[in-house]
């Protein structure tokens, strides 16, 4: 029987910057039961404040509802392991709110083929931002990638969109069901999941593009 | 104990490329970006990019977009900076730096110094 | 990209006394989320160099209350309340709220 080993804060998510959860790794638990507490202070402040939340995020985890997150201020937070035989606490972690974002996926994805009389055939994909992020204050900038792959193909074709919301597709096999996803990230932050699948048949009259 | 250990000294040719590399462990690998920033022989730090080693995902100081490459080998928890077309003002001692969840960098490689002569 | 232009270029400082070093940038740094980062780093002789100071004027892990920061917008300033012999060393002002980010051109200190 042994004390706890050291545990690790090892992801922190936010959905927008909002609200934010952070997770940890039990080390070794010494063969008895072990307490995880989760302490924290804000830059420029000395009072220690425990885990608001240790049950929304799920286990080993510590979640910060609207009222305990700030953009303003990093967050100075580690955790500590307790059992009979004593005691042992992680690394100091910091965490600035704006670098942890992970949106939600994007919205409303519309693919559509274009067929225009004077030009090539083309896929028009189209989507929109993730509901709870706020673009318009400019904290935001949400970068986007697609991808897309025949119904029956085992490989992905990927195209970074950059910071649009819209993305024209020029070769494609005719006769062929597409999958279409997008997800998005912000320029400091993590990749959304894909967003659900859409379908798109490619009409057999589909000229490639060379 | 967070270390990032990096490769030992270069020597290369101008029009060459060399490949610097930065061991992490005592933390979880994936969790933080790694930047790099160089220093020249008595001169100041110049960041040349960062990489998220959970998905390689980059950003470059766009002096050096197109001749650094930012790469990770997760199994290894190995991060890894290539320069190609050396001249001699790349003559620098490289580091590798480690951020938490925030853009600023707390741990530091030791440095591997790239001499580039003819 | 930004310009961050340091003074003074070198600095003597009797072991005790205080020490001052600015920093100027071409540009506001404040963030678009309102956070200015703007952090202050020391290379000790043959070392890697190391975090003081983050976000202005916070002291990072480990740091001695006699180094602070202060400043706003695009002037700043490192202060050393009482110089000890430890402290010598190339002090480098940082910006990371534009990309790319750079840094200043160092002050050496050293003791008289």
């Known amino acids: 029987q042994l004390p706890p080993g050291k545990p690790e804060i090892f992801k922190c998510r936010s959905p927008n910057k909002e609200t934010f959860t952070c997770w940890w790794r039990p080390g070794t638990d010494g063969g008895l039961p072990t307490n995880y507490s989760l302490t924290y202070h804000r830059e420029g402040e000395t009072l220690m404040h425990e885990c608001p939340d240790y049950i929304t995020g799920g286990p080993n985890s510590c979640h910060f509802g609207k009222q305990y997150t700030s953009m303003w201020r990093t967050y100075i937070m580690m955790v500590n392991a307790t059992n009979q035989m004593g005691s042992s606490f992680s690394d100091e972690l910091y965490v600035d709110v704006t670098y942890i974002v992970q949106p939600d996926p994007p919205l409303e994805l519309a693919v559509e083929v274009k067929q225009p009389e004077d030009r090539k055939p083309y896929l028009w994909i189209k989507w929109s931002p993730p509901t709870l992020i706020d673009l318009k204050t400019g904290w935001f900038t949400l970068l986007y990638e697609i991808r897309l792959k025949p119904e029956k193909a085992a490989e992905w074709e990927i195209h970074f969109a950059g910071q649009q919301t819209e993305f024209k597709i020029l070769s494609l096999h005719p006769g062929q069901k597409y999958l279409v996803q997008v997800r998005c990230k912000p320029d400091h932050g993590y990749w959304s999941a894909w967003s659900p699948a859409t379908f798109i048949q490619i009409p057999s009259d589909f000229t490639m593009n060379d | 104990e967070v270390q990032l250990v990096q490769s030992g000294a270069e020597v290369k040719k101008p029009g060459s490329s060399v490949k610097v590399s930065c061991k992490a462990s005592g933390y979880t690998f994936t969790s933080y970006w790694i930047h790099w920033v160089r220093q020249a022989p008595g001169q100041g730090l110049e960041w040349i990019g960062e990489i998220d080693p959970s998905d390689s995902y980059t950003n470059y100081n766009q002096k050096f977009k197109g001749r650094a490459t930012l790469t990770v080998d997760r199994s290894s928890s190995t991060a890894y900076m290539e320069l190609s077309s050396l001249r001699s003002e790349d003559t620098a001692v490289y580091y590798c730096?480690?951020?938490?969840?925030?853009?600023?960098?707390?741990?530091w490689g030791q440095g591997t110094l790239v001499t580039v002569s003819s | 990209d930004v310009v961050m232009t340091q003074t003074p270029l070198s600095l003597s400082v009797t072991p005790g006394q205080p020490a001052s070093i600015s920093c100027r940038s071409s540009q506001s740094l404040v963030h678009s989320n309102g956070n200015t980062y703007l952090h202050w780093y020391l290379q000790k002789p043959g070392q890697s160099p190391q975090l003081l100071i983050y976000k202005v004027s916070n002291r990072f892990s480990g740091v001695p209350d006699r180094f602070s920061g202060s400043g706003s917008g695009t002037d700043f300033t490192l202060k050393i309340s009482r110089v000890e012999a430890e402290d010598v060393g190339v002090y480098f002002c940082s910006q990371s709220t534009h990309v790319p980010f750079t840094f200043g051109g160092g002050t050496k200190v050293e003791i008289k």
């Open positions: 730096g480690r951020s938490f969840f925030t853009n600023w960098f707390a741990y």
